[in-house]
């Protein structure tokens, strides 16, 4: 029959070349003579001439070696024609499939590989993959299986043997407990791929293993006693810092600290924060510290990482001895602000209060006193006693030194300290209202007509406060009377004088007397401009002119 | 010589807790993972919980996670299995047994916990 | 169900050579050359015999031998002696959690 089995080549064959491999045949060549040909990819066309054929035998014949790792298989098709060139078969299938021989080594895909594996982990922990590839076949054969081991592990510690490898997935795993980032940061494995399934060739690489940080160290302080000065009523006053060692990654959350006033700190006077750079302690006052109170604290200070351990770690704890610094502080005003009531024009030389001040220093110092700011200038203080005295009268109705009946004074107080200290303090006067103003009117000029007359509204104002006010009550003085009549509205706040006889156009005083209701009584001049009109009128008309 | 000595097994009710305690010599206790390994009786070999050298890392069987719980104190070369909510089925002889060169090796003589009402 | 395959018993006269074997996967016996035996006598705690698939501790016989081929290993007693009679257990290292993978154990009888 015209056909043939696949055919089965080894690649690597050393010859002698033209190798004869099988032989095409046709039946029909008992009635007539025979020629064969072969045509495809390695005879007529690219590769061309990889196989030729005896055209009056029909021999298949390989004319080189053939690599199977460029072309595993080639398809040919055997042709058999007579003498007249006609075709006496179908073109026939021809299959020559290439056999491997280990011909390759494995070939690992980098160099180095790197990965990283958390330190303190366990046994059977994936490290990562390392790959080599074999272009042999690994599918009939085992040229192009390849096997992986870890020929050397350095450095050795603690074990020899940290890691382990898959034979077939290239994994490296953890084998050996032990790994410590702070003892061995880092690992070189040099690892080997093996073909023939590990009894081949072999070929190197480097695993490079990275060892990373867990929190598995906790900070130290070193020193663990501190002694520390600070002056009394310092606040954000750096007191100490605090120096502490971690063997855990510089930088890291596991490094950074994390300090805590575990106690000593009753009374909430410090406070301690991380410096970024140096990772020290600095434990400052948040509040003032006041010697006379209590001269020494005594504080104690945990360190933790701002991760959290790992594992259960012995906390660290630093003792401060914070000895407080006596400083000469300056007197206090009790109150420091003090409100006196005291009434106004009162006479001089009358004592108005006694405003003191404490020394909160313990030693017996002596205090001096003096008036900082007297606005008015109406009170003077005893430099011993603290006592305030009127010396000018106080007048509430003072628009310029008082405001909301309030006058308002600052006093000093000096120790005899050195360098002596000072306080101030504010004395706010009370003023309390005395009748001492009478009733004025408003406006002081008016301008009326001689003829139908209208009646001039006067307002009444009184500095004073009530009852020293309204009502008030009117009265002409001085024959005033005859011309003029002045009354007091109901409300008794504004005064309605009226022309009662004709005057002829000129101006007038008209003698106003005005009493509020505590009789303190005012006269006022109101100078009245009478013109030659009638009604209304707010300036004289200009003599008339006939024509 | 490398020694593993067990203590801390009996008796105990269900839903009751023991502390079981491993105490090592002659090796450098803190470079090593330790593990249990339980059996129970007529039974074999089960795998119960296991800790690195450091304490940072431990492992736990499904059959114990949430009950048991393994730690160690390098500073005294003693392994802890503290086993609460004890029921029937953790009967068993428990072992410590040291982790290194890629075997169990030594393991102690066990300590023999029966859970029973 | 035990992660590793050992036949529940063997036997054999005293003198003759005895295989036990055990068979895992490509995961961990076919995987790492990592096979332990142990031998337990009756209330005994479990003894290592071979490690590394065929590394004798010191003070083993000589006549405890260990192999391996693909993803089965096996422990060969030669000279079978009264004292071999116990169970004998194989475990493997495997990648993950738990790292150990134990067989069912196999009792061996000396007859």
């Known amino acids: 029959d015209w056909v043939v089995a696949p055919i089965s080549v080894p690649e690597n064959g050393k010859g002698p070349f033209p190798q004869r491999l099988n032989q095409l045949k046709s039946n029909k060549d008992r009635d007539t003579k025979i020629f064969y040909s072969i045509t495809g990819p390695g005879a007529d066309s690219p590769p061309e001439g990889v196989f030729a054929v005896e055209k009056e035998t029909g021999w298949l014949l390989l004319n080189k070696p053939l690599d199977r790792e460029e072309i595993a298989k080639y398809e040919l098709f055997g042709h058999a024609v007579s003498e007249n060139g006609a075709s006496v078969e179908d073109p026939m299938n021809i299959s020559i499939i290439v056999t491997d021989q280990n011909d390759h080594k494995p070939k690992f895909t980098q160099d180095t590989f790197r990965g990283s594996v958390l330190e303190g982990v366990l046994p059977g922990t994936s490290v990562m993959q390392v790959t080599a590839t074999d272009e042999d076949d690994a599918i009939y054969t085992y040229n192009g299986v390849v096997a992986y081991s870890i020929h050397s592990q350095e450095p050795k510690d603690p074990h020899d043997l940290m890691f382990t490898i898959h034979r077939s997935t290239g994994t490296i795993s953890v084998i050996s407990s032990g790994l410590d980032r702070e003892k061995v940061p880092e690992y070189t494995l040099t690892i080997q791929a093996t073909d023939m399934d590990g009894d081949g060739s072999t070929t190197t690489a480097v695993a490079v293993v990275e060892i990373l940080d867990a929190n598995d160290n906790a900070p130290m302080f070193d020193p663990q006693k501190y002694e520390a000065h600070v002056p009394e009523n310092a606040v954000g006053h750096e007191v100490q810092r605090l120096t502490v060692t971690d063997l855990d990654a510089p930088n890291s959350p596991a490094w950074r600290a994390t300090y805590l006033i575990m106690g000593g700190d009753d009374g909430d006077h410090f406070t301690i924060t991380t410096h970024p750079e140096s990772n020290q302690g600095i434990l400052t006052t948040r509040k003032g510290l006041d010697f006379e109170a209590k001269n020494q604290h005594t504080l104690y200070v945990e360190v933790t990482n701002e991760a959290p351990f790992v594992l259960k770690l012995p906390t660290s704890t630093a003792t401060i001895v914070v000895h407080v610094e006596d400083v000469n502080e300056a007197p206090v005003f009790v109150p420091p602000s003090k409100v006196v009531e005291v009434q106004e024009g009162i006479p001089t030389g009358e004592p108005v209060c006694v405003y003191t001040a404490e020394d909160p220093d313990k030693e017996n110092q002596k205090i001096s006193y003096r008036i900082l700011r007297d606005p008015a200038g109406w009170l003077a203080m005893d430099p011993d006693s603290g006592q305030v005295t009127a010396v000018g009268t106080l007048d509430r109705e003072d628009e310029q030194f008082v405001r909301n009946n309030i006058y308002e004074v600052m006093v000093l107080a000096m120790d005899n300290g050195s360098p002596p200290t000072t306080g101030t303090g504010t004395l706010l006067l009370t003023l309390i209202d005395v009748n001492d103003h009478g009733p004025v009117p408003e406006p002081r000029q008016i301008t009326i007509c001689n003829q139908s007359p209208v009646r001039q509204v006067l307002n009444i104002t009184d500095k004073d406060l009530s009852p020293h006010t309204s009502p008030f009550q009117a009265q002409l003085t001085d024959d005033s009377d005859i011309y003029w009549t002045a009354e007091v509205n109901e409300e008794g706040d504004t005064v309605v004088l009226s022309l009662k006889k004709f005057l002829k156009q000129d101006t007038y005083d008209v003698h106003l007397s005005l009493s509020d209701h505590g009789n303190k009584e005012q006269l006022t001049v109101i100078r009245a401009t009478v013109c030659d009109c009638h009604g209304h009128v707010e300036t004289c008309p200009g003599p008339w002119k006939g024509g | 010589e490398v020694q593993l000595l067990e203590s801390g097994g009996g008796l105990v009710q269900p839903g009751g807790s023991l502390r079981l305690s491993c105490a090592a010599s002659?090796?450098?206790?803190?470079?090593?993972?330790m593990s249990w390994v339980r059996q129970a009786p007529g039974k074999g070999l089960e795998w119960v919980s296991a800790?690195?050298?450091?304490?940072?890392?431990?492992y736990y069987a499904d059959s114990v996670k949430g009950r048991f719980t393994i730690s160690r104190d390098n500073s005294k070369n003693t392994l802890y299995l503290q086993m609460n909510s004890l029921r029937a089925e953790d009967t068993a002889v428990y072992y410590c047994a040291k982790w290194g060169d890629g075997t169990l090796n030594p393991w102690g003589q066990g300590t023999m916990v029966t859970v029973s009402s | 169900q035990s992660a590793l395959t050992q036949p529940a018993s063997v036997s054999g006269s005293p003198g003759q050579s005895i295989t036990i074997s055990c068979t895992g996967t490509?995961?961990?016996?076919?995987?790492?050359?990592?096979v332990s035996w142990y031998q337990q006598h009756p209330g005994k705690a479990p003894k290592l015999m071979i490690s590394?698939?065929?590394k004798r501790p010191s003070g083993v016989s000589n006549r405890f031998s260990g192999s391996k081929s693909g993803n089965t290993a096996s422990l060969t007693i030669s000279g079978l002696q009264a004292e071999d009679e116990a169970d004998y257990y194989c475990?493997?290292?495997?990648?993950?959690?738990?790292?150990?993978?134990f067989g069912g154990g196999t009792k061996l009888t000396v007859l």
């Open positions: 800790i690195s050298g450091s304490g940072g890392s431990t």
């Open positions: 475990s493997s290292f495997t990648s993950g959690l738990p790292w150990v993978v």
């Open positions: 590394e698939v065929n």
């Open positions: 490509s995961n961990d016996v076919g995987a790492y050359n990592y």
């Open positions: 002659g090796f450098t206790f803190s470079s090593y993972a």
